[in-house]
């Protein structure tokens, strides 16, 4: 039969009225030994039932020493079978035995739940000897008992290699509702339903949720754990926790924000990095989000420029990093730069525009009418051109890059020469005899090298060779470039 | 053993307000409710809300919204009854009881001795 | 609001004669978790209400049994088998089945 103890009467008590046998105690069960040594064998029993034996886990003795009368069956005698009690008490609870004389060495160990308990658990086992028998108490004390205290107790004895094992103890230990799911953190779309959840659990049982919304009860009548609250939807941001309550009282959750998902806030501190001729490196910082991660953005660029149409270029970009290089841009130009960035709900108005301007560019076309011819006298090659007609962006022409090729047989070499801006003709020494001298000429901006003209070639013929007849760039329209030897 | 012990009796002239308070000993404050009772001469009791004694969230039945409100002092472990712009009909017996929700319902286990305000011009 | 009728309104009973309050809602107290929140409270003289009995038939710690609680849906019944001199006072129904929580009038039991 199975006994139980308990604690002081409960507002409710899951056994409701008296029960046989039964206890719930806060501090110690009714068979719990006085911390005191010596002989005692009054209390060697359970004062809820006298011992017993049963047929179950018993050493049944061979022989006496005299070997004429069988022993009676080896068991522990029956005690308590459950006890429960609060959180934070203290418990102590006892298997007793009564052993013949004749056996030698006898130890008592405690298992919970299926395992041995070693080491720093308050463990006592006491011996009463008699004529024919010692009665052993084994004591087991729990301090300020937590929910992992719960579970059933044993004793175990070996004797003669046979195992003796207790009835289990089964201890309860009650509190406040534990939370095993609480609500989330959510971010939810204007209007849309979304559910929150909340678990608690004892002992004992049952547990009964409240859900709470900014610091108003949602549900008047508790619901039992677990709950789950459908929300219809939300306009504007909320706080929601839940209370769970059983027979030990109430505990509540934690208060968790649900956040409404808007659009984001612009981007700010758009900062100009790089500038070249045709592209413009930015960052930015980002807005807060609207509770949405950022999906990509949008770099907006205007041509400030009273000619221009005010059409605005679009380039769009990931959200991170937060950096864009924006190319195809026309050199020496003035932009208006603005970046919106989006997340699922749509697009954040446009940062700050900031003014950014590109730098020169180099000039988009090579010098005309270049043209080539031998002074041997001077044992030199004299170069002529026209001045290209450059656009504004280009910039300030600050010179000219004049490139000469020199080939003849099994050698070839390239020399580049630098003049200042306001020449329109150059002198380059003869580097090579009887070879071939291809000529090309680039304009030179701040911006950097235009194109190079088509190629003049010009012979060089062994020295005695005379020949003033130039060589020039064709006329526009015209074929390939002659060569006049 | 857990005690609830509220404030003396209150005489007040239409229109103040009165705070009126409920000590709690002997348990763990925090971890129950306080319900509120009104008990007029000759009248049924009637249940005015409850607050969490926690969370301070308070709940009340719709003929006490507006000029009531609960309150708590929790390191003093005491919940308090405040009614605003006090009428005639406000004098009554007020009681507070502790309060939870356990497995036969709500609990109401122990009352406090009650607190009787009078109203009167 | 649920309305909670108790009659009689006074009960006059000789200590040691049985005693019977009744106690109708006006709604089903049947909760939707299969729970009656039927409770009955005892005010005595001068005191403040002590709880007595819930779900319908359950005692409190230290309440006697010779109270005892039936009933089910609307209608609720408290008896007391051999009245004592300490149960005079005044026995309230409550109901904690619906929102707001309410209270019968109150059944005022004395000795003869």
């Known amino acids: 039969a199975i006994t139980e103890a308990r604690e002081e009467a409960k507002p409710y008590p899951l056994f409701p009225g008296p029960l046989p046998g039964s206890l719930q105690t806060d501090h110690t069960s009714l068979l719990s030994l006085p911390h005191t040594s010596g002989y005692q064998p009054a209390l060697m029993f359970s004062p809820t039932q006298p011992g017993r034996p049963y047929t179950g886990n018993v050493a049944i003795p061979r022989v006496t020493s005299a070997g004429s009368k069988l022993l009676p069956p080896l068991a522990f005698k029956h005690t308590v079978g459950h006890i429960i009690l609060s959180e934070h008490k203290d418990v102590k609870f006892n298997c007793s035995i009564s052993v013949p004389n004749i056996y030698q060495d006898t130890t008592i160990s405690w298992w919970k739940d299926g395992k041995e308990l070693l080491g720093a658990h308050h463990a006592i086992t006491q011996f009463y000897p008699d004529d024919e028998v010692t009665a052993i108490i084994a004591s087991f004390s729990i301090t300020s008992v937590q929910r992992s205290d719960n579970g059933s107790y044993i004793c175990k004895m070996k004797i003669n290699n046979e195992e003796i094992v207790s009835d289990p103890i089964y201890i309860e230990v009650q509190g406040l509702p534990h939370f095993t799911k609480q609500p989330e953190s959510m971010n939810v779309t204007r209007n849309t339903a979304f559910n929150l959840t909340c678990q608690a659990v004892g002992p004992p049982e049952p547990v009964n949720i409240f859900w709470v919304q900014n610091s108003s009860r949602v549900n008047e009548q508790p619901e039992k754990s677990p709950s789950v609250l459908t929300v219809p939807g939300l306009t504007e941001m909320a706080v929601f926790s839940c209370e769970a309550h059983n027979d030990k009282g109430l505990t509540v959750s934690k208060g968790v924000q649900i956040n409404i998902k808007a659009i984001p806030s612009p981007p700010t501190e758009v900062s100009i990095h790089n500038s070249t001729a045709h592209s413009i490196l930015i960052s930015w910082v980002p807005g807060f989000d609207g509770y949405s991660p950022f999906r990509n953005c949008s770099v907006q660029v205007k041509e400030v420029d009273p000619l221009s149409n005010g059409s605005v270029m679009i380039f769009n970009t990931s959200a991170s990093p937060h950096m864009y290089q924006i190319k195809q841009l026309q050199a020496l130009a003035n932009y208006s730069i603005g970046v919106s960035c989006m997340n699922e709900i749509g697009w954040s108005a446009v940062s700050p525009w900031i003014l950014a301007s590109t730098t020169e560019g180099a000039p988009s076309v090579a010098p005309l009418n270049v043209t080539v011819f031998l002074n041997e006298s001077r044992d030199n090659v004299d170069i002529r051109w026209m001045k290209p007609l450059t656009k504004r962006q280009a910039g300030e022409l600050v010179g000219y890059r004049i490139s000469h090729v020199w080939q003849s047989a099994g050698i070839s070499k390239e020399l580049l020469e630098e003049v200042g801006q306001n020449n329109s003709r150059a002198q380059i020494s003869v580097q090579v005899h009887n070879a071939t001298c291809t000529v090309r000429i680039a304009a030179v901006t701040k911006g950097g090298v235009g194109p190079f003209s088509d190629p003049v070639k010009i012979f060089i013929p062994a020295h005695g060779w005379v020949d003033h007849a130039p060589s020039s760039t064709p006329a526009p329209g015209n074929a390939d470039p002659v060569l006049i030897i | 053993q857990i005690q609830l012990v509220q404030s003396g009796p209150e005489l007040k002239k239409p229109g103040e307000t009165v705070k009126i308070s409920c000590k709690a000993s002997g348990n763990t404050f925090t971890t129950y409710g306080m319900s509120w009772v009104k008990q007029a001469p000759g009248k049924n009791l009637k249940w005015m809300g409850w607050i969490n004694n926690y969370s301070g969230v308070s709940t009340y039945a719709d003929d006490f919204k507006g000029r009531f409100a609960f309150s708590l002092e929790t390191s003093a472990t005491t919940a308090y009854l405040q009614i605003n712009n006090l009428t005639n009909e406000d004098s009554a017996t007020y009681f507070c009881?502790?309060?939870?929700?356990?497995?036969?319902?709500?609990?109401?286990?122990?009352w406090g001795q009650g607190t009787t305000l009078t109203v009167s011009s | 609001d649920v309305v909670m009728t108790q009659t009689p309104l006074t009960l006059s009973v000789t200590i040691g004669q049985p005693a019977s309050i009744s106690c109708k809602s006006s709604q089903s107290l049947l909760d939707s978790d299969g729970k009656t929140y039927l409770n009955w409270l005892l005010q005595r003289p001068g005191q403040s209400p002590k709880r007595l009995m819930y779900l319908v038939s359950k005692l409190d710690s230290g309440v006697p049994d010779r109270f005892t609680g039936s009933g089910s849906g609307t209608d609720f019944t408290l008896k007391i088998s051999r009245v004592e001199a300490e149960d005079l006072g005044v026995y309230y129904c409550?109901?904690?089945?619906?929102?707001?929580?309410?209270f019968g009038g109150g059944t005022k039991l004395e000795i003869k």
């Open positions: 009881a502790r309060d939870y929700y356990g497995s036969g319902g709500w609990v109401f286990d122990y």
């Open positions: 409550w109901q904690g089945t619906h929102f707001p929580r309410t």
